[in-house]
Amino acid sequence: QEEDLPRPSISAEPGTVIPLGSHVTFVCRGPVGVQTFRLERDSRSTYNDTEDVSQASPSESEARFRIDSVREGNAGLYRCIYYKPPKWSEQSDYLELLVKESSGGPDSPDTEPGSSAGPTQRPSDNSHNEHAPASQGLKAEHLY
């Protein structure tokens, strides 16, 4: 009997505090066999999918979501979810991205490493579909 899918983890490179205009890459990790990783922003209201999935280790796959030039509007909460046919995983914990003005000061590091994994509650919002592609006849918001 197959158990529930393991929760994904999320991390940010080079960290979770990013100077304005710098780049950041969110890294989503899950088990081998993932078809699609989804990076959700602010409680599912927007998301980005990728099927560019690579094997990070014999037991783990990953996908990377890069923002080339971070703007203030990129600040917020992010989390990962994945589709391993025929079902979706639970979400990762949230990771908060902070955007700061470039100070250039030598005393303050530009980034702080950050990652998030483990248990989390499903959101109670019903906004999963808000920016989703047309559902071709299916209503959404009712997950397993």
Epitope: Q35, D49, K87, H128, A132, P133, G137, H142, L143, Y144
Partner: antibody
Framework: QVQLQQSGAELARPGTSVKLSCKAS????????LSWVKQRTGQGLEWIGE????????YYSDKVKDKATLTADKSSSTAYMELRSLTSEDSAVYFC??????????????WGQGTSVTVSS | DIVMTQSQKFMSTSVGDRVSITCKAS??????VAWYQQKPGQSPKTLIY???NRHTGVPDRFTGSGSGTDFTLTISNVQSEDLADYFC?????????FGAGTKLELK
């Protein structure tokens, strides 16, 4: 609207192969999977396998791993199922069905009209 | 493999009746169950997805319920066009598996 148009009926000799097609329209072909389902006359439905055209990943029932091969052509939005080493047990109607998963759940929602395969010497 | 058991192979009903078709999974499949209607010579038509959600265009006399291992498709105010075969499907795990079907016929 979503449509899955399947190829016409096939009459084949035992031991040969057939290749069935399923042309998709009305949605983005690479955003969904495509399942194939077998139904023998007067019988129930049997899942054969599923392919994800975006990357070609496919999943099969253990029963048909040596019988069926699923492929997809993104340029023509067409999925294919090849059945080989045909026997009378393969005589059936074969349906393709869209496997929709974009909104955070799975649903086999739209079905093709079916292709009848008759294996006879 | 997960076995989906539809214990009633045939069910007799009359126009206007309410009928419930059941499906039992051999293990917990959460709400990953769909219901299909099939008429002779036609392809299956999706009625219910995720145990309780009506597909587009499906009349509201069709209702799905259940989660875990026990699922029910209820047709209230049966119409003559509802006479058909009904199949459940689990999509929690591969291989996807269907119930054997329940044929709804007139008394």
């Amino acid at each position: 609207q979503v449509q899955l148009q399947q190829s016409g009926a096939e009459l084949a000799r035992p031991g040969t192969s057939v290749k069935l097609s399923c042309k998709a329209s009305g949605y983005t072909f690479t955003s969904c999977g495509l399942s194939w389902v077998k139904q023998r006359t007067g019988q129930g439905l049997e899942w054969i396998g599923e392919i994800y055209p975006s990357n070609g990943n496919s999943y099969y029932s253990d029963k048909v791993k040596d019988k069926a091969t699923l492929t997809a052509d993104k340029s023509s939005s067409t999925a294919y199922m090849e059945l080989r080493s045909l026997t009378s047990e393969d005589s059936a109607v074969y349906f393709c069905a869209r496997a929709y998963y974009t909104n955070g759940y799975y649903a086999m929602d739209y079905w093709g009209q079916g292709t009848s395969v008759t294996v006879s010497s | 493999d997960i076995v989906m058991t539809q214990s009633q192979k045939f069910m007799s009903t009359s126009v206007g009746d309410r009928v419930s078709i059941t499906c039992k999974a051999s293990q917990n499949v959460r709400s990953a169950v769909a219901w299909y209607q099939q008429k002779p010579g036609q392809s299956p038509k999706t009625l219910i997805y995720l145990a309780s959600n009506r597909h587009t265009g499906v009349p509201d006399r069709f209702t799905g319920s259940g989660s875990g291992t026990d699922f029910t498709l209820t047709i209230s105010n049966v119409q003559s066009e509802d006479l058909a075969d009904y199949f459940c499907l689990q999509h929690w795990n591969y291989p996807l598996t269907f119930g054997a079907g329940t044929k709804l016929e007139l008394k």
